[in-house]
């Protein structure tokens, strides 16, 4: 649908996008689950956090994640002022001082302890190609999304806009 190399054009200038404020415009505490209703859980093991994708037992409490929404200006190749519009970027924090990070070298998603200002690896561009599902695209690597691979979170390359609807990069947010 997009002509030039799918997602690369679709998200052409993420590297150049700048977050317009150091404060989030809103924050949202939610549990994170896959398109197939498996829960994303976080466990402290050997002084570091592990991330799991698993079926929860009945009545087992879901882990919550704090999603912080930031606005980011998007450079334009069309509009005269050089700014086409705004994107929403999110950071995801399951516990105080820990944030999800994209490790592009290892194609992995990791929890890192860090202080603000957060590094670019902690920011993900928010997409929703379904009304009730979201996807998270790496700010540092356009066209690469958080996805599910072998019951773990991983970074998955999406090579065309049609594949933005692929189930393994779709996540559901819920308050319960």
């Amino acid at each position: 649908a997009f002509g030039i190399s799918g997602v690369q054009k679709y998200t052409r200038a993420l590297h150049d996008s700048s977050i317009t404020g150091i404060s989030p415009i809103t924050e949202y505490l939610a549990s994170l689950s896959t398109y197939n209703d498996q829960s994303i859980t976080f466990a402290l093991e050997d002084e570091s956090y592990e991330i799991y994708v698993e079926d929860l037992k009945k009545d087992e409490k879901k882990d919550k994640v704090l999603l912080s929404y930031y606005e980011s200006q998007h450079p334009s190749n069309e509009s005269g002022d050089g700014v086409d519009g705004k994107m929403l970027m999110v950071t995801l924090s399951p516990t105080k001082d820990f944030w999800l990070h994209a490790n592009n070298k290892e194609h992995s998603v990791e929890l890192h302890k860090c202080e603000k200002p957060l590094p670019d690896q902690a920011f993900f561009v928010l997409h929703n190609m379904h009304s009730n599902c979201v996807s998270f695209e790496c700010k540092t690597d356009p066209g690469v999304f958080i996805g599910v691979k072998d019951n773990h979170l991983a970074l998955i390359k999406v090579d065309s806009s049609e594949n933005l609807c692929t189930e393994n990069i779709l996540f559901k947010l819920s308050e319960t």
Epitope: A1, F2, Y10, I25, T26, Y28, A30, Y69, E71, H74, S76, N77, E78, S79, D84, G85, K86, M87, L88, V125, L126, H127, N128, M129, H130, S131, N132, S161, E162, L164, C165, E175
Partner: antibody, heavy 121, light 106 residues
Framework: EVQLVETGGGLVQPGRSLKLSCKTS????????MYWIRQAPGKGLEWVSS????????YYPDSVKGRFTISRDNAENTIYLQMSSLRSEDTATYFC??????????????WGQGSLVTVSS | EIQMTQSPSVLSASVGDRVTLSCKAS??????LDWYQQKLGEAPKLLIY???NLQTGIPSRFSGSGSGTDCTLTINSLQPGDVATYFC????????FGGGTKLELD
Amino acid sequence: EVQLVETGGGLVQPGRSLKLSCKTSGFTFSSYWMYWIRQAPGKGLEWVSSITPNGGNTYYPDSVKGRFTISRDNAENTIYLQMSSLRSEDTATYFCAKGHYYYTSYSLGYWGQGSLVTVSS
Amino acid sequence: EIQMTQSPSVLSASVGDRVTLSCKASQNINKHLDWYQQKLGEAPKLLIYFTNNLQTGIPSRFSGSGSGTDCTLTINSLQPGDVATYFCFQYNNGWTFGGGTKLELD
């Protein structure tokens, strides 16, 4: 400058069909959710349809589901609303709107001026 | 489907007044709420997004607040140009408008 211009409205008999167009300019059309919203004379706003940036998913309220179809042409920067089996209660001004943010269905950042559809015999 | 209820449906106020408009959702909408202003014969215009963020170019006398199911639009020091109908809009689950509040001058 962002512009959205609706065309195709007019007088139509009950049970007949009509197709609205919304031609846009001034933004990267293929990266935005797009919407149709309507307003009956003297009444409030009613969401009518939404479409994702790549056109792969479309959404409707029960009041128009099965009768209205939203579509888009990303090469022409245009969205459409095909309305069939029209009823008198579909009489309204139809606005197209663009999402406020790239890639997400949050907020209606810009609206067109609207196109009046009158369903009457 | 989430229902959005605005009150009052009509509000009369004087220039300089502080005006408060209410919007109540039938379930938690997680601050996924906008306010739109529609003047007579015009298209609606985005004023406030994500409950409390002012859209570029909108005067600072407009502000939004709230969480959960209850949200409020406040206009500090009402101006003649603020006469309009104001609609709330949720996008937490589907898309729904409130019925609107028509703001008039005394």
